[in-house]
């Protein structure tokens, strides 16, 4: 239904707290360099204005669209051109072009310092002094670093943060209470960020149809007892919610997500038997819980997929009649039977099925042509299964850090032109798949591994798009989203690459490395490893292991030495010489 004042409607639906949080996220995701105070001021002005519209929907400007209202606010910021360069040109445009322009200027890798967590006492003091401002800072800092973070889900993480601080700041040992809990939230939030970015990429590059196909597969796996009409309705609603969030319409997105959660909870009987515990929770927790609810038990009497999609005499007629609906039912039927497959794999199978019908239905004897289609799925299914087995075996043998290093070597050989920080970040993220997925039961490994890898590789593609340097990466990133992971997996050593010359300073370290946290130490060592591979792309695993073991030994020795500086300055050059010899 149309509302006289869109801003009043959203304020009423969402309530002041969520309204303010979402407006802050929106502004922080659009203008990523502005300080918290600048954004907080704008948020307060927008909120005050919304309240006047709630009191009188006919008041001046209350009938304006949210894009117009928010865009006008952003464009009124002083020194916009000095701070944001050509983004200021967006302000010369009219809606909807102005909003599109803002979206195009979102930076997936803003040059902001890493978000450092203050020490426990300081954190608790500022939290107790002003919890609202404290949480505002959290929303601002996360949103500006992750400009596509799923806004209603960020509100959920802020709520988690709040609960942890409330609990731990009352403890005697605040540090040991806070650290593991906040680390857990951070890890989950980072995964949520790359997953959502993947959804927005799907929407931006391939449109709503592609996202809806993803949603149909995912929902069919989770709700195998829901019928196709129900799955289609949920997928349509979910597509709308994600389209809004990816498009910067965060108030509409959060409002529609709440509506979808309400609908699901009111229609549990036709959706799933597993929803009740989620539906008993308050809004943010409820929506989060529904998004990762366990799969319902599969119906016992599902007929073989071949009956309707291969053996039926009407296959080509049904396909001709309504291509998207027929392919949608295929995707639904296949997905509900295979919670053990990744969504990416299910979409590849649906694509293969579509291509087979396109070819076969144009032949004189289609049934003879498409009769073997299910057998042709076999290699497509085996490939990711082998990937999971190989990688989980390697992870179990090497542990997370060693597994990250193996991936780092592999990916540096595939794309040595990519910057070392990007390679290290990608390898560390890809390597976490082991900890995240390889410990799961067998039937959950494949979906976990492949869908997580796809999301991480999407980030690699986004960063590479900014400065394209590798033809290998460009090739894999140019194809469809579901083909990316197999494309990257199939890449081998880039034969066109001219090895980097050996620079001693790249492998020269100082005593300050000794005081770094373990994570930072690992990153330093992994940076050196990537540089070694760039110097010797065809070095054997054995050679690289020898050098890295030597390097680890050197760090251990010098960091324990009484005179660390002397140790580093005398033993360092010896290490460099040994490295050169080992790789010769």
């Amino acid at each position: 239904e149309a509302h006289k004042s869109e801003i009043a409607h959203r304020y009423n639906d969402l309530g002041e707290q969520h309204f303010k949080g979402l407006v802050l996220i929106a502004f922080s995701q659009y203008l990523q360099k502005c300080s918290y105070d600048e954004h907080a001021k704008l948020v307060q002005e927008v909120t005050d204005f919304a309240k006047t519209c709630v009191a009188d929907e006919s008041a001046a400007n209350c009938d304006k669209s949210l894009h117009t209202l928010f865009g006008d606010k952003l464009c009124a910021i002083p020194n916009l051109r000095e701070n944001y360069g050509e983004l200021a040109d967006c302000c010369t445009k009219q809606e909807p072009e102005r909003n599109e322009c803002f979206l195009q200027h979102k930076d997936d890798n803003p040059s902001l310092p890493p978000f450092e967590r203050p020490e426990a006492e300081a954190m608790c003091t500022s939290f107790k002094e002003n919890p609202t401002t404290f949480m505002g800072h959290y929303l601002h800092e996360v949103a500006r670093r992750h400009p596509y973070f799923y806004a209603p889900e960020l509100l959920y993480y802020a709520e988690q943060y709040n609960e942890i601080l409330t609990q731990c700041c009352a403890e005697a040992d605040k540090e040991s209470c806070l650290t593991p809990k906040l680390d857990g939230v951070k890890e989950k939030a980072l995964v949520s960020s790359v997953r959502q970015r993947m959804k927005c990429s799907s929407m931006q590059k391939f449109g709503e149809r592609a996202f809806k196909a993803w949603a149909v597969a995912r929902l069919s796996q989770t709700f195998p007892n829901a019928d196709f009409a129900e799955i289609t309705k949920l997928a349509t609603d979910l597509t709308k919610v994600n389209k809004e969030c990816c498009h910067g319409d965060l108030l509409e997105c959060a409002d529609d997500r709440a509506e979808l959660a309400k609908y699901m909870c009111e229609n549990q009987a036709t959706i799933s038997s597993k929803l009740q515990t989620c539906c008993d929770k308050p809004l943010l927790k409820k929506a989060h819980c529904l998004s990762e609810v366990e799969h319902d038990t599969m119906p016992a009497d599902l007929p073989a997929i071949a009956a309707d999609f291969v053996e039926d005499q009407e296959v080509c007629k049904n396909y001709a009649e309504a291509k998207d609906v027929f392919l949608g039912t295929f995707l639904y039927e296949y997905s509900r039977r295979h919670p053990d497959y990744s969504v990416s794999l299910l979409l590849r199978l649906a694509k293969k099925y579509e291509a087979t019908l396109e070819k076969c239905c144009a032949e004189a004897n289609p049934p003879a042509c498409y009769g073997t289609v299910l057998a042709e799925f076999q290699p497509l299914v085996e490939e990711p299964k082998n990937l999971v087995k190989t990688n989980c075996d390697l992870y179990e043998k090497l542990g997370e850090y060693g597994f990250q290093n193996a991936i780092l070597v592999r990916y540096t050989q595939k794309a040595p032109q990519v910057s070392t920080p990007t390679l290290v970040e990608a390898a560390r993220n890809l390597g976490r798949v082991g900890t995240k997925c390889c410990t799961l039961p067998e039937d959950q490994r494949l979906p976990c591994v492949e869908d997580y890898l796809s999301a991480i590789l999407n980030r690699v593609c986004l960063l590479h798009e900014k400065t394209p340097v590798s033809e290998h990466v460009t090739k894999c990133c140019s194809g469809s989203l579901v083909e990316r992971r197999p494309c990257f997996s199939a890449l081998t050593v880039d034969e066109t690459y001219v090895p980097k010359e050996f620079k001693a300073e790249t492998f020269t370290f100082h005593s300050d490395i000794c005081t770094l946290p373990e994570k930072e130490k690992q990153i330093k060592k992994q940076t050196a490893l990537a540089e070694l591979v760039k110097h010797k792309p065809k070095a054997t695993a054995e050679q690289l292991k020898t050098v890295m073991d030597d390097f680890a030994q050197f760090l251990d020795t010098c960091c324990k030495a009484a005179d660390k500086d002397t140790c580093f300055s005398t033993e360092g050059p010896n290490l460099v010489t040994r490295c050169k010899d080992a790789l010769a």
């Epitope: 005499q313 296959v315 007629k317 001709a320 239905c361 144009a362 004189a364």
Partner: nanobody, 115 residues
């Protein structure tokens, strides 16, 4: 929605000829193979002939081989069946179908071969 409309049937003497047409709409005609299927009174459907989407590939039942010719005009979204040397056993309702199916979503056209 797929729609198929057959025409051209009628009464013909043994040894005579008829040309059946089938006008198609509601889908991308050239992307689908098409067939003629017939059903004699009191019998099940019997496949007669098929043609690929491009028209380059054709198949015939043994009972009509050498007498019937299937063709199509993709610019007109129309399928044809040229029937020569007709016999009394060719008497049936003739249907056009999509993609090798034996389904009958259309009315069909009656062909009667009798002296």
């Amino acid at each position: 929605e797929v729609q198929l409309l057959e025409s051209g049937g009628g009464l013909v003497q043994p040894g005579g000829s008829l040309r059946l047409s089938c006008a198609a709409s509601g889908f991308t005609f050239r992307s689908f193979g098409a067939s003629w299927v017939r059903q004699a009174p009191g019998k099940g459907p019997e496949w007669v002939s098929s043609i690929s989407g491009s028209g380059s590939d054709t198949l015939y039942a043994d009972s009509v081989k050498g007498r019937f010719t299937i063709s199509r005009d993709n610019s007109k979204n129309t399928l044809y069946l040229q029937m020569n040397s007709l016999r009394p056993e060719d008497t049936a309702v003739y249907y056009c179908t999509i993609g090798g199916s034996l389904s009958r979503s259309s009315q069909g056209t009656l062909v009667t071969v009798s002296s």
